[in-house]
């Protein structure tokens, strides 16, 4: 057994640009408090998974009111350490979550409102009994400076608080089978401490925290006698089928405690030790209130202080669920129009628009031709978020800046040969064809559907009827 201790040194704006806004204002003065959650091992569990090693809540800090125009300073802190007692061995490796909470002290009629300002988390190795370890963690624009240590509660010692020491009964040596307790040479290793409440008469242990029953006794604390019948097997209790020594039903059999409560036997019945947030004879009543800090990801808790009060979490953008624990993929709703790319930045959605579109959701179709000129006499044609130039004869490319090869499209029909010319193209037609693109056959009787060739041109010569 022992205690994990956390000392908060400062909470305020981190270095660098973008100092955070003060969490308090003249209209809404507030004060801070901290919550620490510990889990064994180097687990990367979700923030809402149980704090299996324990959790603690600090006292409230002094009331703070922002000075208008002043940058957010280091905020006033609560006094004292946060202490998380642990009953079993210290695991050596652990995960922590430290949350900074703001308590608003405006004139809310329903009592104060709580909201999460910052959450830091980490995984560390730490031996019990060592010196204070210092740490700095950043959460957004905030910076938290703190120290922590684990110490064993007497009589436990060692890096895991599993060795037990007692003052020597005799000045010279320890009892049979017990070694001196280094570094406390004047103390001796003590016998193991069994589970709390384990019957000293009917129980024993071979590991700390264990409770194993002697013959004839049962139950988690070896306080329930095994019911006997008229026969006894020579080897002690036998199975129920023989009718000998059948264990009697214990009040904790089947664990009557709901919601993760632990059952312990009492002389008359049983008692449930309920986890935080539950109460009632069998831990069946949920009593989570805003004081338990149920809202994650900066959700604002609304609810009364009475355990019967309901609570709701007012979630920031990008989160949903009854405790703001679920991240929303807001881009799955495809909010960006006209093929825009959606970016979920957490605090806001951004759309990266395709060329020719603008607006928060790319909803505005820009005048594609505005400020765009088509060269060499081309004309601009709008459409589809991109401008297009319809080029004059002899020019091509996006802006009509490239000289076109008029023959590239093979414009001369019926095997005519194409020649580029400063004023366009010229087709030299194959025998039997004529026309600007060699599209007309020459009539079989030698007559043509077109006027006779001008003087100086034979029928096979290039035709320039353009």
């Amino acid at each position: 057994a022992g205690v994990f201790e956390l000392q908060i040194h400062s909470f305020g704006p981190g270095p660098g640009p973008g100092a955070p806004r003060s969490p308090c204002s003249a209209r809404l003065p507030c004060r801070l408090f901290f919550r620490v959650c510990l889990k064994p091992g180097l687990s990367e569990e979700a923030a809402e998974s149980p704090c299996a090693l324990g959790a603690a809540l600090s006292a409230r800090g002094p009331v703070y009111t922002e000075q208008p125009g002043a940058p957010a300073p280091d905020l006033p802190l609560p006094d004292g350490l946060l202490q998380v007692p642990f009953r079993d061995a210290w695991p050596g490796t652990f995960s922590f979550i430290i949350e900074t909470w703001r308590e608003e002290l405006g004139d809310q009629i329903g009592g104060p409102a709580w909201s999460l300002l910052a959450r830091v988390a980490g995984r560390r190795r730490l031996a019990a009994g060592g010196p204070w370890a210092r740490d700095i963690q950043r959460a957004g624009a905030w910076e938290l400076r703190f120290s922590y240590r684990a110490r064993c509660e007497p009589p436990a010692v060692g890096t895991a608080c599993t060795r037990l020491c007692r003052p020597r009964s005799a000045p010279s040596r320890c009892g049979p089978g017990l070694r001196p307790c280094a570094p406390l040479e004047d103390e001796c290793e003590a016998p193991l401490v069994c589970r709390a409440g384990c019957s000293p008469e009917h129980g024993f242990c071979e590991q700390p925290g264990e409770c194993r029953c002697l013959e004839g006794w049962t139950g988690p604390l070896c306080t329930v006698p095994v019911s006997t019948s008229s026969c006894l097997s020579p080897r002690g209790p036998s199975s129920a089928t023989t009718g000998c020594l059948v264990p009697g039903p214990g009040p904790c059999d089947g664990n009557p405690c709901a919601n993760g409560g632990s059952c312990s036997e009492t002389p008359r019945s049983f008692e449930c030790t309920c986890p935080r947030g539950f109460y009632g004879l069998r831990c069946e009543v949920s009593g989570v209130t805003c004081a338990d800090g149920p809202c994650f990801n900066g959700g604002l808790c609304v609810g009364g202080a009475d355990p019967d009060s309901a609570y709701i979490c007012h979630c920031p953008p990008g989160f949903q669920g009854s405790n703001c624990e679920k991240r929303v993929d807001r881009c799955s709703l495809q909010p960006c129009r006209n093929g825009g790319l959606c970016l979920d930045l957490g605090h806001a959605l951004r759309c990266r628009c395709r060329a020719g579109f603008a607006g928060p959701r790319c909803e505005h179709d820009l005048d594609d031709c505005a400020g765009r000129a088509c060269a060499n006499g081309g004309t601009c044609v709008e459409g589809g978020g991109a401008h297009r130039c319809s080029c004059a004869l002899g020019f091509g490319g996006r802006d009509c800046r490239e000289r076109a090869d008029p023959c590239a499209a093979r414009p001369c029909a019926h095997g005519g040969r194409c020649y580029a010319h400063f004023s366009g193209l010229v087709c030299a037609c194959a025998p039997g064809y004529m026309g600007a693109r060699c599209e007309f056959p020459v009539h079989p009787d030698g007559a043509s559907a077109l006027p006779a060739a001008p003087p100086g041109l034979r029928p096979g010569d290039p035709q320039r009827y353009l």
Epitope: Q108, G110, L300, V302, H314, C315, F319, G321
Partner: nanobody, 115 residues
């Protein structure tokens, strides 16, 4: 300052029903968390039922299964249907709405349940 306006309270026999309404008001929009609080004489005010801005509902343990909260965003109105009323439900019921910056309250409506 804009205030919320409750209606529907009154005197009812144990086991009876009442339906409280709040609004219409431009405050009661889907981006706000809304709820019904109650305060009995000599006791602190507690949230009976609420709907968060993301649509999650929650109820006080003592009213679960008997009370139903709902909102009509088109009509900017909040409701609380109260069935199987008990004498311990006697209190002043307040309509409530909030966003991250502000919170809004009604003046309250009295609900009295006779044994």
């Amino acid at each position: 300052e804009v205030q919320l306006q409750e209606s529907g309270g009154g005197l009812v026999q144990a086991g009876g029903s009442l339906r409280l309404s709040c609004g219409p008001s431009e405050i009661i929009t889907s981006d706000k968390s809304v709820g019904w609080w109650r305060q009995a004489p000599g006791k602190q005010r507690n949230l009976v039922a609420g709907i968060s801005n993301v649509g999650s509902t929650n109820y006080a343990q003592s009213v679960k299964g008997r009370f139903t909260i709902s909102r009509d965003n088109a009509k900017n109105t909040l409701f609380l249907q109260m069935n199987s009323l008990k004498p311990e439900d006697t209190a002043v019921y307040y309509c409530y709405a909030r966003d991250f910056e502000n919170e809004y309250w009604g003046r309250g409506t009295q609900v009295t349940v006779k044994p």
